[in-house]
């Protein structure tokens, strides 16, 4: 018989139901926006906006200050009062649409859905390690703003993204707002604009540059601005919008818009379609050739990448990469593949593709039929002509007008579909050591911290835990404060360590000490933890072996048994070769001699499953008693592996030494030709790993083995005679004197 250890699924080495409690703050209402500030004097703050309220929190998430931002028309609205005596517009709740830091001052800028989407500026006043907001300044000059031209009307009730850029001594606000006909008719917000904050903080300078969805398209063509960021010489917006001005408006795709961060102009406004797909390793019949498209961006974040991912993406370590979580449609409903996929777009490649697209539009010879695009913003035209014109005039440049690059940038899911049913709603990417980690919030209120690698067929989790008991979706915007990330879910803000919330979800020592160095995990006798959790017994250098099972569960008191031990941390080396004298197995008082590994039995074990086997020959000592006992494996003096060395003892109960007893044999005669079915009856006949019935020294072929009975077919006899019959278990003879009589056939 060839018994094999059962495989242990990789998932059994971790428990994602372990409860972690991370610091949190109850904001008193649905969190609408959140931003963090870290000063250069060790002072820091978290700003959290809810309807009609702005909270200032310290780095410990304790409330430092609160401000009433609404309702507009309410005498208690502190921001409204900064605009002087009202009324300033229709009364109503203030939902915060923009919450950004102006790093130049530094100051916090908040813009809401009320008061024509105007903004308020709050100087930051660091006092000790805390930060307070000065009284708000109203960024609105009544005499400069009209319904048809309102430089101080920034936020759209449908959503606005803002990135602030310092240019010289001035702060420029790169603003992107979702519009519809009703919003556009009210104080004229723009789709994309660049606005300079006036030095006296009385609002934004008039005459700003802007692009807006043309009135005829406002009803059918809506653009959702998902994310904005500034890196290098550009500001980028990420949008979800209809793929075509003329076709079905529900057919959406994702675009990247690029604007110059060094010149407050929109002549070099460029758009590029981002294409993210799930391409399974084995393509199903009928599945699209390039993989299943996931056209709708849900969340995005850009970050420099660690060495390993950089190599996989064929870029240099530390280069900026845009990561996006994409779904199949607005509802993000389940398709054939996973609910969410993650694609990586190196910024350098995006810029190259855009620059090449511009050249393609503007260079000679002209590429016939190439459209400038962006027909929702500008009049249709063919390259190299400016919008709405038939030809270039001598004093205009093709390059000085907005352009949609004709080719899209395609990427495939980094996780190979392994996110499965998970619906990702928040994303923040960090580089820890040389590892790139995606910190993801989910629809059901969990945080997944996963290494970003593409070469594996399973996810490498730093952690996977529930933020609280509410199960509410984690919101899109994530902020970083020191070594923590701030996630919002419902009315709560949670502070999650970048290194993970802890180590208790790793259940085995091996999994614990194989965890990333940055997690600070160590073994505490019987659990995985960080040093502060168990300072006495915490160590990171060795793991005891772990016995999970053995076979067989019984063996003869006399004679040998080939014992197979199952578990983990036996070897640390795939070959399973054991240096002399490192492994000591005892069963009861008796030693079990290690057997060399049978190389023919070595089988590759996929990383998703793991099991280690160790075989030894058990020869009970004369002093060994019958009955139940323990199996003990002690490993010492093993050379260290990559992560730790094996050292220690594991004990498992459940082995029994038994004495086989033969009570009866029948029939006691049979033909000389052999083939008689012998039945041997007794007790403990099946113990151990080997048994033999010998008729005159020749083996009687065993047909059935059970605890109380053996069946075998007699071998042919040399002559008609009475011959000795014996039973050996584990190579030792079972007491008793039996004979079998060969008769004429």
């Amino acid at each position: 018989e060839d018994w094999q250890c059962p495989r242990t699924p990789y998932a059994a080495s971790r428990d994602f139901d372990v409860k972690y409690v991370v610091p949190s703050f109850s904001a008193g209402g649905l969190v609408q926006a959140m931003v963090t500030y870290e000063g250069d004097r060790n002072e820091s703050a978290v700003f959290v906006a809810i309807r009609n309220r702005l909270h200032v929190l310290g780095p410990d998430l304790k409330s430092v200050q609160s401000l009433a931002t609404g309702p507009a028309g309410d005498p208690g609205c502190q921001t409204c009062a900064a605009c002087g005596p009202g009324p300033h517009g229709p009364p109503g709740d203030t939902d915060t649409k923009v919450l950004v830091l102006d790093p130049a001052l530094p100051a916090l800028v908040s813009c809401g859905s009320s008061l024509q989407g105007r903004c308020f500026l709050h100087d930051l006043e660091p006092q000790g390690t805390a930060v307070h907001l000065a009284a708000p300044a109203c960024l609105f000059s009544a005499h400069h703003n009209r319904p048809d031209d309102c430089p101080d009307c920034v936020a759209s009730p449908l959503g606005t993204r803002v990135t602030v850029v310092e240019q010289g001594q001035a702060s420029y606000f790169y603003v992107a707002s979702s519009l519809d006909a009703a919003v556009a008719a009210s104080f004229s917000p723009r789709s994309v604009s660049i606005r300079r904050l006036k030095a006296d903080a009385s609002g934004f300078a008039p005459g700003f540059v802007a692009l807006s969805v043309l009135p005829k398209h406002l009803v059918s063509y809506s653009i959702e601005y998902v994310h904005s960021f500034h890196t290098g010489a550009f500001v980028y917006f990420l949008t979800v919008q209809p793929a075509s001005v003329t076709d079905d408006p529900s057919a959406l795709h994702t675009r990247l818009a690029r604007l110059s961060a060094t010149e407050p102009e929109l002549g070099d406004y460029r758009e590029l379609v981002l294409d993210c797909r799930f391409a399974p390793k084995r393509r199903r019949r009928g599945a699209p050739e390039g993989g299943q498209p996931y056209p709708v961006l849900r969340v995005a974040h850009s970050a420099p990448v660690g060495a390993q991912l950089a190599t996989e993406l064929s870029i240099a370590e530390g280069q900026e990469v845009l990561f996006g979580v994409f779904v199949t449609g607005k509802d993000g409903g389940p398709g054939v593949g996973p609910n969410s996929v993650v694609c990586a777009f190196p910024i350098d490649l995006l810029d190259t593709l855009i620059d090449e697209g511009v050249e393609r539009c503007c260079e000679s010879p002209v590429h016939p039929g190439l459209r400038r695009g962006l027909d929702f913003f500008q009049s249709p035209s063919f390259c190299p002509n400016p919008p709405g014109l038939e030809a270039l005039s001598p004093n205009t440049s093709c390059r000085h007008f907005p352009l949609l690059v004709s080719s899209s940038f395609s990427r495939v899911d980094l996780f190979n579909g392994l996110l499965g049913p998970v619906q990702v709603t928040a994303l923040y990417v960090t580089r820890l050591d040389n590892v790139t980690v995606a910190h993801m919030g989910t629809m059901d209120g969990r945080i997944l911290q996963v290494e970003l690698v593409r070469s594996l067929n399973y996810l490498l989790y730093v952690s996977n835990f529930s933020l609280g008991d509410s199960g509410q979706p984690v919101q899109r915007d994530v902020s970083r404060l020191g070594d923590h990330l701030l996630f919002a879910s419902g009315d709560q803000v949670f502070q999650v360590p970048i290194q993970g919330p802890g180590c208790r979800h790793f259940l085995t020592c091996g999994r614990c000490l194989r965890a990333w160095h940055f997690m600070g995990c160590g073994w505490c006798g019987n659990m995985c933890g960080q040093q502060k959790e168990c300072p006495g017994s915490w160590q990171q250098d060795h793991c005891p072996p772990k016995l999970t099972e053995f076979h067989p569960h019984s063996g003869p008191l006399r004679g040998s048994t080939r014992l197979t031990l199952c578990g983990s941390n036996f070897y640390l080396h795939p070959s399973g070769l054991v240096p002399e004298g490192t492994h000591q197995v005892t069963v009861g008082q008796s030693p079990c001699r290690p057997l060399p590994k049978d190389s023919s039995k070595l089988r590759p074990v996929p990383r998703k499953d793991f099991v280690e086997e160790f075989e030894c020959e058990l020869e009970p000592l004369g002093t060994q008693a019958v009955g139940p006992t323990n199996v003990s494996l002690t490993v010492t003096n093993m050379p260290p592996g990559k992560h730790f060395r094996v050292d220690g003892t594991s004990v498992l109960r459940g082995f029994s030494f038994m004495e086989p007893v033969l009570i009866a044999v029948q029939p006691l005669f049979g033909p000389r030709a052999g083939g008689t079915c012998l039945t041997l009856e007794g007790q403990s006949l099946s113990v151990g790993t080997s048994r033999a019935v010998l008729v005159n020294g020749t083996e009687c072929l065993l047909a059935r083995v059970s605890e109380g009975q053996l069946l075998c077919a007699t071998p042919p006899g040399a002559t008609v005679a009475s011959v000795p019959l014996s039973l050996q278990v584990g190579g030792a003879q079972v007491p008793g004197s039996w004979t079998f009589q060969y008769r004429e056939d």
């Epitope: 009062a81 900064a82 709050h122 100087d123 006092q127 307070h132 000065a134 300044a137």
Partner: antibody
Framework: QVQLVESGGGLVQPGGSLRLSCAAS????????MSWVRQAPGKGLEWVSY????????YYADSVKGRFTISRDNSKNTLYLQMNSLRAEDTAVYYC??????????WGQGTLVTVSS | DIVLTQSPATLSLSPGERATLSCRAS???????LGWYQQKPGQAPRLLIY???NRATGVPARFSGSGSGTDFTLTISSLEPEDFATYYC?????????FGQGTKVEIK
Amino acid sequence: QVQLVESGGGLVQPGGSLRLSCAASGFTFNSYSMSWVRQAPGKGLEWVSYISSRSSTTYYADSVKGRFTISRDNSKNTLYLQMNSLRAEDTAVYYCARGYFHGMDYWGQGTLVTVSS
Amino acid sequence: DIVLTQSPATLSLSPGERATLSCRASQSVSFDYLGWYQQKPGQAPRLLIYGASNRATGVPARFSGSGSGTDFTLTISSLEPEDFATYYCQQYNINPFTFGQGTKVEIK
């Protein structure tokens, strides 16, 4: 220790101008909002003006709006109050005070402004 | 503008007695952006309480502030000789910031 010292007060005719200064020391001036508060002889305290740490926000009492201008020079750790079109009812001791959210926690000793013909 | 009304205008008490000073706002003061100040003749005011109930640095424990919304109270649990002075409340919630007219605590 924190010190606020006002200067620039004196006698001025109605319609005239004065510029008050407040020299700050002993703390990080550019981290604090500052205010001017005045007290007419035998009367209570009257808040006059407020300026945030980086001058982004300035507030004024209705009684001085359009006539007084608050400013600060963080490089000189100094707060100013430019007073134009002075009236007899502006006669008071003018105090500069530090702080906003935690109240006005430090005050100068005041400088007297007398508007009289 | 938020008008702060302090009462009583004058409070005549003996040392060791408890003083209760009231400050009523014409409209709600959000998040308790309200302070109490003490002023003695010929001196600059001194901050006692901020945020309606937080004692400023160095202020003795006999001074306490309470209240929220529109009604605020300053309590001196046991008057010491040096506590006889004029007390002002101030809101710094809504522009323009305003002071109450003051309560004078005098020796009976």
